[in-house]
């Protein structure tokens, strides 16, 4: 019953179980999803502009199940997707067409995860396996960040495939599954 997904590379299953805050309350309804929280948030970089709307690092709420192979969390979790461009686009003259064209100038800023939170989830697995406790790292806030060559490129990917950490002690399942099936599937509503 319920079948929509969205992958987020910034989200990962954390094998260690430590002390973390309790998870937030579950969503009452899906009207809270896909909300642009900070569409006009103040810039986090020193561009000089009078138009704050030029900065569009948005925090979009979404809800998803955490899955790992054939296992799925008992309840969905809610986190953020970082969306939008950072920095004003400068209006520059276009010599060929005698018109104007947009080109970003100045340092390269991206809307990427800023802070994370950890949440404990219970993974349900088929075949009578006992539920497994897992920690997942969820995006808690987004920020316009200046890119450097030392930046972790995974922060910039548009929700590509994430390789899961190997699972200790997992019994091999007789069912044939695609190679991707053992990845930590991060399935979300968007």
């Amino acid at each position: 019953q319920g079948w929509q997904a969205f992958k987020n590379d910034a989200t990962e299953i954390i094998p260690e179980l430590g002390e973390y805050p309790e998870p937030p309350p579950e969503l009452e309804n899906n009207k809270t999803m896909n909300r642009a929280e900070n569409g006009g948030r103040p810039p986090h970089h020193p561009f000089e502009t009078k138009d704050v709307s030029e900065y569009s690092c948005r925090e979009l709420h979404f809800t998803r199940y955490v899955t790992d192979g054939p296992c799925r969390s008992a309840k969905p979790v809610t986190e953020l997707v970082c969306s939008g461009q950072c920095g004003p686009a400068r209006l520059l003259p276009n010599a060929i067409g005698r018109g104007k064209w947009w080109r970003p100038s100045g340092p390269d800023f991206r809307c990427i995860p800023d802070r994370y939170r950890a949440q404990r989830v219970q993974l349900l697995c088929p075949g009578g396996e006992a539920p497994r406790a897992r920690k997942v790292r969820l995006v808690a806030s987004c920020k316009c960040k200046r890119l450097t060559r030392f930046h972790n490129q995974s922060e910039l990917k548009d929700f590509g495939t994430e390789a899961a950490r190997p699972q200790k002690g997992r019994k091999p399942r007789p069912r044939a599954r695609s190679a991707k099936a053992n990845q930590a599937e991060l399935e979300n509503a968007y």
């Epitope: 079948w3 969905p76 075949g127 991707k180 399935e187 979300n188």
Partner: antibody, heavy 118, light 112 residues
Framework: CQSVEESGGRLVTPGTPLTLTCKVS????????MNWVRQAPGKGLEWIGA?????YTYYATWAKGRFTISRTSTTVDLKMTSLTAADTATYFC??????????????WGPGTLVTVSS | AQLLTQTPPSVSAAVGGTVTISCQSS????????LAWYQQKPGQPPKLLIY???TLASGVPSRFKGSGSGTQFTLTISDVQCDDAATYYC????????????FGGGTEVVVK
């Protein structure tokens, strides 16, 4: 705009294999859970199976072995074998609210009709 | 295999009245709340009304209310409108040897 549309439904004779295709637009299949559901004329809905974003598939008990769900970058396929008249139905492709079952299916295609008759 | 039994198979209601549809599951759904309700009109695909047993889907009027837990669920339509004439289905998600979903047999609502 997000949409799904099924194709491949036609009149086939019993025993003929048939593959239905669900073409999606406006979202990525690599980050979606897709389901196949069928409905015989004048009857109720019947869940066939699903494919999760990581490629994991699961099926209704009655569909195992005879139905196979797979996907490409833009399509989800339902391969059916050993068809009988009882498989005559409209076949729906559906994308849901949350991943991997649990939140209700919110995006349905119009369906494609499969008729099995000799 | 899991069995979802809907009752009644058909029900008639007057405009402004109330309709109650029951959905009984042969085993508990996942998390006791992985159950959804759909509305389907002839020639159309189903439309999601309720998910997680009681959560109203986006754009669905509050006249539709889902309740229940575990194996017993109810869809209540209050202040019935002509547009509510349709067939309603429950759908549950289960976990045993593998994941599976199942639909109820459907309830036809006729509005007088």
């Amino acid at each position: 705009c997000q949409s799904v549309e099924e194709s491949g439904g036609r009149l086939v004779t019993p025993g003929t294999p048939l593959t239905l295709t669900c073409k999606v637009s406006g979202f990525s299949l690599s980050s979606s859970v897709m389901n196949w559901v069928r409905q015989a004329p004048g009857k109720g809905l019947e869940w066939i199976g699903a494919i999760w974003s990581g490629g994991y598939t699961y099926y209704a008990t009655w569909a195992k072995g005879r139905f196979t769900i797979s996907r490409t970058s833009t399509t989800v396929d339902l391969k059916m074998t050993s068809l009988t008249a009882a498989d005559t139905a409209t076949y729906f492709c559906a994308r849901g609210q949350f991943g991997a079952s649990g939140g209700g299916d919110v995006l349905w295609g119009p369906g494609t009709l499969v008729t099995v008759s000799s | 295999a899991q069995l979802l039994t809907q009752t009644p198979p058909s029900v008639s209601a007057a405009v402004g009245g109330t309709v109650t549809i029951s959905c009984q599951s042969s085993q508990s759904v996942v998390n006791n709340n992985n159950l959804a309700w759909y509305q389907q009109k002839p020639g159309q695909p189903p439309k999601l009304l309720i998910y997680f047993a009681s959560t109203l889907a986006s754009g669905v009027p509050s006249r539709f209310k889902g309740s229940g837990s575990g194996t017993q669920f109810t869809l209540t339509i209050s202040d019935v409108q002509c547009d509510d004439a349709a067939t309603y289905y429950c759908q549950g998600t289960y976990l045993s040897d593998d994941w599976s979903d199942a639909f109820g047999g459907g309830t036809e609502v006729v509005v007088k």
